[in-house]
Amino acid sequence: PGPPPGPPRASPDPRAELDSTVLLTRSLLADTRQLAAQLRDKFPADGDHNLDSLPTLAMSAGALGALQLPGVLTRLRADLLSYLRHVQWLRRAGGSSLKTLEPELGTLQARLDRLLRRLQLLMSRLALPQPPPDPPAPPLAPPSSAWGGIRAAHAILGGLHLTLDWAVRGLLLLKTRL
């Protein structure tokens, strides 16, 4: 006879699962802040930069009080997938000026990818309904000029920074209710 079966796998502690997700999010937030500061030092921003293809910020005045875990994770995953796509686009089409942000931009992409996988795992561990497969997104048009690429980088890093702050605040708030 084979070895006795091991103990049944303990059901995940949702607080511990959330904790490790928050840790990754905070870590990515720090990376994003550092990279945004680096970008500002090299190419000072003249006011706010927007990019129409970026997701709108998930948090509004009343939204944080009414958060539910499935909604937060689904929204966060969708937004971060969009930011991952934008970071990949920036690295590919951003032009020579943005090459000075390597290898940090590559590290950011890898960590963003890791957080997305962590969110996917969290959703399956907590037996939350899995979102449908993402529809193919229309390709992002290359920036019209070198300065266009820099403006896009400001918008992407600024938006990602705010989205990750929303995520940390939302996830920690939800943790207090578990």
Partner: antibody, heavy 119, light 111 residues
Framework: EVQLVQSGAEVKKPGASVKISCKAS????????MDWVKQAPGQRLEWIGD????????IYNQKFTGRATLTVDKSASTAYMELSSLRSEDTAVYYC????????????WGQGTTVTVSS | DIVLTQSPASLALSPGERATLSCRAS??????????IHWYQQKPGQAPRLLIY???NLESGVPARFSGSGSGTDFTLTISSLEEEDFATYYC?????????FGQGTKLEIK
């Protein structure tokens, strides 16, 4: 110079409300959260909540939920805290403080606003 | 909520001496290399001032005689050689979870 300047001292009667302002200057207002902290005589500092000026999204310490309301006026780089249904235990110095996004440490503080609740 | 306990409640030392202030958390405030403890100094009639963030990072403009250490539940703020202006009350604060909470403070007095 990075500065947070708060409104002046207030004396209120029990049951009333108070609204304190905090004007930020010397930095991009939307790059940091604005937090509010209470310091009552002989008590430890107590976090009330924070607000993200970019979106106007507040979060609260459960102890203050329902009585504290945090708002911002982005165009004036000003944050506000309103505290309702005042009682004697609300007598304290209230501080606004600039909070690092996602980390809740406070690197710049207002000078404090003294609120006295007395009948 | 996480409770932070500071010791001693008060400490009397002379200028030039080394001060060691302790902060203990009711549960771990560290995760994978990050320790979510911050230290502040407060003088009478003034707002708190950030000295150390994330356990060991010196805030810009703070003298190098201040340092922070520790992980898990036990943290220390050290002032290597006390100056006259260091006599004040010191608070630790965590931001591991919501809500962030503060210790009750250690009052550092001149002997």
């Amino acid at each position: 110079e990075v500065q947070l300047v708060q409104s002046g001292a207030e004396v209120k009667k029990p049951g009333a409300s108070v609204k304190i302002s905090c004007k930020a200057s010397g930095y991009t207002f939307t790059d940091y959260n604005m937090d509010w902290v209470k310091q009552a005589p002989g008590q430890r500092l107590e976090w009330i909540g924070d607000i993200n000026p970019h979106s106007g999204g507040p979060i609260y310490n459960q102890k203050f939920t329902g009585r504290a309301t945090l708002t911002v006026d982005k165009s004036a780089s000003t944050a506000y805290m309103e505290l309702s249904s005042l009682r004697s235990e609300d007598t304290a110095v209230y501080y606004c403080a600039r909070g690092e996004l996602g980390h809740w440490y406070f690197d710049v503080w207002g000078q404090g606003t003294t609120v006295t609740v007395s009948s | 909520d996480i409770v932070l306990t500071q010791s001693p409640a008060s400490l009397a030392l002379s200028p030039g001496e080394r001060a060691t202030l302790s902060c203990r958390a009711s549960k771990s405030v560290s995760t994978s290399g990050y320790s979510y403890i911050h230290w502040y100094q407060q003088k009478p009639g003034q707002a708190p001032r950030l000295l150390i963030y994330l356990a060991s990072n010196l805030e810009s403009g703070v003298p190098a005689r201040f340092s922070g250490s520790g992980s898990g539940t036990d943290f220390t703020l050290t002032i290597s050689s006390l100056e006259e202006e260091d006599f004040a009350t010191y608070y630790c604060q965590h931001s591991r979870d919501l809500p962030p909470t503060f210790g009750q403070g250690t009052k550092l007095e001149i002997k």
